[in-house]
Interface confidence: medium
């Protein structure tokens, strides 16, 4: 029992020293590109960090396969409604995998935050939060998209963010 017990203790200690992959990315002035691509994120300043995950052009890149809790919140707001706004705004987390040519929907929400019928002077606020556990392989990527991104408010790194951690 003694040697087996000490072996288990050693394994536990080793596990506790292994760093679970985690990242929290925050909204920045450069997040909204207007190009139709995914949102871009701050990875280093303020509350943002990357640990055991990498980042590339808006995407969190998985380096270690496993189950991950992924999440994103976007703060929406405006004065009246932007011209050309679709009837709904889609906020989604999407997976890119080398095994498939198109992005795959992971978590998606739809909002109708500002009705065109209201007065154009109406200041409004809304938000969308997504979070869930998904399995990701090494090399796969997760991105955030918002259509219409013009409604995303970024003022500081606390309102709109994107992250993941291995569970």
């Amino acid at each position: 029992d003694g040697p087996a017990g000490s072996w288990e203790q050693l394994i536990q200690e080793r596990r506790s020293h292994e760093v679970n992959p985690a990242a929290h990315l925050t909204g920045a002035n450069s997040s909204l590109t207007g190009s139709g691509g995914p949102l871009l994120w701050e990875t280093q300043l303020g509350l943002a960090f990357l640990r055991g995950l990498s980042y590339h052009d808006g995407a969190l890149v998985v380096t270690k396969a496993g189950y991950y809790y992924i999440y994103s919140k976007v703060q929406l707001g405006g004065v009246g409604c932007p011209l050309g706004l679709a009837s709904t705004i889609t906020h989604g987390l999407y997976k890119r995998t080398p095994r498939y040519p198109e992005e795959l929907e992971l978590l998606v929400s739809q909002q109708s935050p500002c009705g065109r019928a209201t007065s154009s002077s109406r200041v409004w606020w809304d938000s969308s939060f997504l979070g869930g556990v998904v399995h990701l392989e090494a090399g796969e990527e997760v991105v955030v998209r918002v259509l219409d991104e013009r409604l995303v408010r970024l003022r500081d790194g606390t309102r709109s963010y994107f992250g993941a951690f291995m569970v």
Epitope: V79, L83, G84, A86, R150
Partner: antibody, heavy 121, light 111 residues
Framework: QVQLVQSGAEVKKPGASVKVSCKAS????????VHWVRQAPGQGLEWMGA????????SYNQKFKGRATLTADKSTSTAYMELSSLRSEDTAVYYC??????????????WGQGTLVTVSS | DIVLTQSPDSLAVSLGERATINCKAS??????????MNWYQQKPGQPPKLLIY???NLESGIPDRFSGSGSGTDFTLTISSLQAEDVAVYYC?????????FGQGTKVEIK
């Protein structure tokens, strides 16, 4: 470079209609609003409305609603402003202008050269 | 509608001197830390030209002698050292709500 080229000067009789065109180049036409602003001789600037070429959505100054029609043709990257039931006080230079991508903070960063519309009997 | 009142209506300034134009809105044009006020320059026979957007941001290609400041209802356009080519009419414009409105204009001349 971004360019907005408007159609030529028009002389119209009271009660008639006029249609001014604004051909855009140098940017993605469907991603930016096109606004129309007029300026009577020796006077200030007056916003008439805007069109979003991506889906044809429009917003009008109530003063012109029912008399002005704003449209956009994606195939030719051209925006149009039609004003009906013309009266002498509609004599003005009519400008098209590109609005910024963010509508709520819509500043006009590129302007057409202007089209003089004269309404006279 | 939001009414913008500029002062003065006209301004004569010596070359190299500072010119200051004020614009007062009938209600606040602030939202989420931004002020939706813009400034344009118009020379005779030409369309207006964007100088400053969202109160204090200098449009690319505009000389840095132009600056904008203010928030809420009170805004200022400053030309730090007037040049001959700055002779024009200057307009403020709010984009907080439609109908977007302009001030009546301020004519800047050389003294």
């Amino acid at each position: 470079q971004v360019q907005l080229v408007q159609s030529g000067a028009e002389v119209k009789k009271p009660g008639a209609s006029v249609k001014v065109s604004c051909k855009a180049s140098g940017y993605t036409f469907t991603s930016y609003n096109v606004h129309w602003v007029r300026q009577a001789p020796g006077q200030g600037l007056e916003w008439m409305g805007a069109v979003y070429p991506g889906n044809g959505d429009t917003s009008y100054n109530q003063k012109f609603k029912g008399r002005a029609t704003l449209t956009a043709d994606k195939s030719t990257s051209t925006a149009y402003m039609e004003l009906s039931s013309l009266r002498s006080e509609d004599t003005a230079v009519y400008y098209c202008a590109r609005g910024s991508y963010y509508y709520t903070s819509s500043y006009f960063d590129h302007w057409g050269q202007g089209t003089l519309v004269t309404v006279s009997s | 509608d939001i009414v913008l009142t500029q002062s003065p209506d006209s301004l004569a300034v010596s070359l190299g001197e500072r010119a200051t134009i004020n614009c007062k809105a009938s209600q606040s044009v602030d939202f989420d830390g931004d002020s939706y006020m813009n400034w344009y320059q118009q020379k005779p026979g030409q369309p207006p030209k964007l100088l400053i957007y969202t109160a204090s941001n200098l449009e690319s290609g505009i000389p840095d002698r132009f600056s904008g400041s203010g928030s809420g209802t009170d805004f200022t356009l400053t030309i730090s050292s007037l040049q001959a080519e700055d002779v024009a009419v200057y307009y403020c414009q709010q984009s907080y709500e439609d109908p977007f409105t302009f001030g009546q204009g301020t004519k800047v001349e050389i003294k």
